[in-house]
Interface confidence: low
């Protein structure tokens, strides 16, 4: 088992909104849960955008999940990752 590296980034979307993207890479096996949570509760599927779980050429995998949030509310959102029985949460950088 190889645990993922998780990286959260933010980018400007429309005025007053930002897109936050959570990327997991370098993990094995491919089974992973990656999702955005607001106040500790998973966002609905229709408010998140997922990348496919894809091989990265090193025998490991990579994927991402993104959502759009209101600027100023970043502290309410975390990226939740679960892989091979281990889990972690990752905040949005300020």
């Amino acid at each position: 088992t190889v645990p993922p590296m998780v990286n959260v980034t933010r980018s400007e979307a429309s005025e007053g909104n930002i897109t936050v993207t959570c990327r997991a890479s370098g993990f094995y096996p491919w089974n992973i849960t990656l999702s955005w949570r607001q106040d500790g509760v998973s966002l609905s599927h229709d408010t998140q955008q997922w990348g496919d779980v894809l091989p990265d050429g090193n025998g490991t995998y990579q994927t991402w999940v993104a959502t759009r949030i209101c600027q100023g509310e970043e502290q309410r959102f975390t990226c939740y990752m679960e892989h091979s029985g281990n889990h972690s949460t990752h905040p949005v950088p300020s």
Partner: antibody
Framework: EVQLVQSGAEVKKPGASVKVSCKAS????????IYWVRQAPGQGLEWIGY????????IYNQQFKDRVTITADTSTSTAYLELSSLRSEDTAVYYC???????????WGQGTLVTVSS | EIVLTQSPATLSLSPGERATLSCSAS???????LHWYQQKPGQAPRLLIY???NLASGIPARFSGSGSGTDFTLTISSLEPEDFAVYYC?????????FGQGTKVEIK
């Protein structure tokens, strides 16, 4: 309805370059990768590479890495495949395809025939 | 690179017969990353079965898939005239993504 519409057939001389377009509609363009695959006459399918339009990541089949450029324009929901230094063995139908789950190819363009002939 | 070998190269059968197509991988593949496509002359391939055994949208139930590890099978329980085509397996578990060389199902 998901649709991938490719540009028309091309005839090129050896050593030239060709650029094939693939316009996507019926879904959020940045939600799925665009794969490129080619099929030589009477032959099987060969994966060239893919682009993830959302984060701009591009991964190539090493066999094509030196001669292929894959790009995407999210403003027009269009992906492009450019192949340079063409040779006769590049004569093939080039397909774009949308990525489905677990790296499959769930929707396909109609194909673009590229003929390389002197 | 994972090499997929399909057998037989050609399968000659009559409508109503059962077709069994094999796909053998040079290395073990997670069943979640093995897919099947159908291609008719002059047309683009279309996704038939994904993740070894799941029917793609609009694909009739006479198609089924099974297998694990290195050996996978596509079965057509009773061939219809429109099923005569070339079938490809594909793996998405490691780069480069690869296809089998195809099995042509032709009318006997």
């Amino acid at each position: 309805e998901v649709q991938l519409v490719q540009s028309g057939a091309e005839v090129k001389k050896p050593g030239a370059s060709v650029k094939v377009s693939c316009k996507a509609s019926g879904y959020a363009f940045t939600s799925n990768n665009i794969y490129w695959v080619r099929q030589a006459p009477g032959q099987g399918l060969e994966w060239i590479g893919y682009i993830d339009p959302y984060i701009g990541r591009i991964i190539y089949n090493q066999q094509f890495k030196d001669r292929v450029t894959i790009t995407a324009d999210t403003s027009t929901s269009t992906a492009y495949l450019e192949l340079s230094s063409l040779r006769s063995e590049d004569t093939a139908v080039y397909y774009c395809s949308r990525s489905g789950e677990r790296s499959n190819f769930d929707y396909w363009g109609q194909g673009t025939l590229v003929t390389v002939s002197s | 690179e994972i090499v997929l070998t399909q057998s037989p190269a050609t399968l000659s059968l009559s409508p109503g017969e059962r077709a069994t197509l094999s796909c053998s991988a040079s290395s073990s593949i997670s069943s979640n990353y093995l897919h099947w496509y159908q291609q008719k002359p002059g047309q683009a391939p279309r996704l038939l079965i994904y993740r070894t055994s799941n029917l793609a949208s609009g694909i009739p139930a006479r198609f089924s898939g099974s297998g694990s590890g290195t050996d996978f099978t596509l079965t057509i329980s009773s061939l219809e005239p429109e099923d005569f085509a070339v079938y490809y397996c594909q793996q998405g578990g490691s780069l480069p993504l690869t296809f089998g060389q195809g099995t042509k199902v032709e009318i006997k």
